[in-house]
Interface confidence: low
Amino acid sequence: DAHKSEVAHRFKDLGEENFKALVLIAFAQYLQQCPFEDHVKLVNEVTEFAKTCVADESAENCDKSLHTLFGDKLCTVATLRETYGEMADCCAKQEPERNECFLQHKDDNPNLPRLVRPEVDVMCTAFHDNEETFLKKYLYEIARRHPYFYAPELLFFAKRYKAAFTECCQAADKAACLLPKLDELRDEGKASSAKQRLKCASLQKFGERAFKAWAVARLSQRFPKAEFAEVSKLVTDLTKVHTECCHGDLLECADDRADLAKYICENQDSISSKLKECCEKPLLEKSHCIAEVENDEMPADLPSLAADFVESKDVCKNYAEAKDVFLGMFLYEYARRHPDYSVVLLLRLAKTYETTLEKCCAAADPHECYAKVFDEFKPLVEEPQNLIKQNCELFEQLGEYKFQNALLVRYTKKVPQVSTPTLVEVSRNLGKVGSKCCKHPEAKRMPCAEDYLSVVLNQLCVLHEKTPVSDRVTKCCTESLVNRRPCFSALEVDETYVPKEFNAETFTFHADICTLSEKERQIKKQTALVELVKHKPKATKEQLKAVMDDFAAFVEKCCKADDKETCFAEEGKKLVAASQAALGL
């Protein structure tokens, strides 16, 4: 339905508080280097303008699109050229090209300082002194570091952030109350950002059809009692929501997400029996809860799939009449019967089915040709099952840190050209699959593990896309969204790689390592491990383990020494020499 003023429409729908928060997120996700104060000024100007449009929708400029209004505002930033370089050229373009240009300049790895958490008392004072600014700063800092963060979900995180400070700054032991909550929000936030990044990559790199296929599979697993028509409606609406958010249309996205939550709750009887508690919550919690809701129970006595999709004489007729609808029905029926499969596996099966029909429906005897199509699924199902079994056994044997190290070595040998920080970050995250998924029973392991790995490998893909260094990574990332994990799994040691020159500086450590947290110390050691493999890609597991054990002992010894710095200097030289000898460097 058309509105005279889009900005007035969204302001009224969302309310001033959410409107301001979402505009701040949008601006911070576009201009990631701008100071906080500049963004707040821009947001206030937009908000004041929106209020004039609410008062009179016919007022000057109120009929302009949100992209035009926001783009014009961003292009008033004085330092655009010196801060952002060629992004300033976007401002010479007209909409919609200007917005597309801004989107293309979003940086997944912006050169921003690490967020350092102040002392609890300092944070509580800041919170009480100016709560509004404190919470805006949170939105700004997260949004600029995560330019694809799902905006309505970030409002939910901010609400929990506020609640944590509200409760804990009054507690007897503020730190004991607050720090675990902040750690949880940080970890959940990183996971949420990465999941949304995959959705945006799916839409932007592989198109709406790929996203819709993913959504059909996931929603059919989650809502197996819902009719195909109901699932299709939800998929259409969900696709619109994510297309908007990934496209920077955050006000529309948040508004449409609220409408979708409302629709789901009004129609929960025909969607899922698991929605009741979610639907009793306030809006932000409700939307989050629905997105995370457990799978409903499968209907009893579902008929065999073969009847409609293999044995029926109408398979090719039904396929020809509406290919995507028929394939959507296949995916829906398969997914609702298989909550134990990963979404990417279900999509591989649907792709195999599609390829078979494309070939067989043109053959002399189509039925004879596709009669054994389900037999082709067996190896596709067994491959991830076996891989997960092997890796969970390895995880249980090694524990998370050493399992991460095994993956670090594995992936550095596969793609040694990738930067060390990226290899460390991605391999650490890949390694977390163990503690996240291996504890689950067999029926939940695959959806947990393989869909999580898709999210992590997408991080590798988006970071690599910024600075491409490996044809193998490019190939695995761009050929097929659903086959990314099997593609990386299949990579062997890169025999074309020329080992890196040995540089003693890379393996020189100082006393500051002793004051680092356990996590940061692990990252230091894992960085050294990647560098070792880059110098000696043919080193055996045993050789690397010996060197890493020596390294751990060296750090422990020098951190206990009276003169730590001297110890690191002298013992470090000995360690480098011993390692060179052990690895033949």
């Epitope: 509200t166 009054q170 009793e280 306030p282």
Partner: nanobody
Amino acid sequence: QVQLQESGGGLVQPGGSLRLSCAASRFTLDYYAIGWFRQAPGKEREGVSCIASSGGSTNYADSVKGRFTISRDNAKNTVYLQMNKLKPEDTAVYYCAAAVLECRTVVRGYDYWGQGTQVTVSS
């Protein structure tokens, strides 16, 4: 530990009025939605009214609309329930409860509860 204390209950004749207070100690009510609930003997606890942390949003059970008014005084760290035109069926123990920021639609959505105050409407 967060504490809520109700007061203002008592015996009143039908058609009379009472004003219940819910005072918080050891924490500030500014960031909490406060709900009033009641429980009559042998019945489940039911929502009566709620006011959001901002004070801008209030809601009432159908049975008390037009008779009860909820308000808050953040300076006094207290929320009030003004009850007019009381009826015998309003007889119950009245409880106040707090939830961060927004009203909840279910009893279990509230984090902190008071001990309750008895209201008896009888001639």
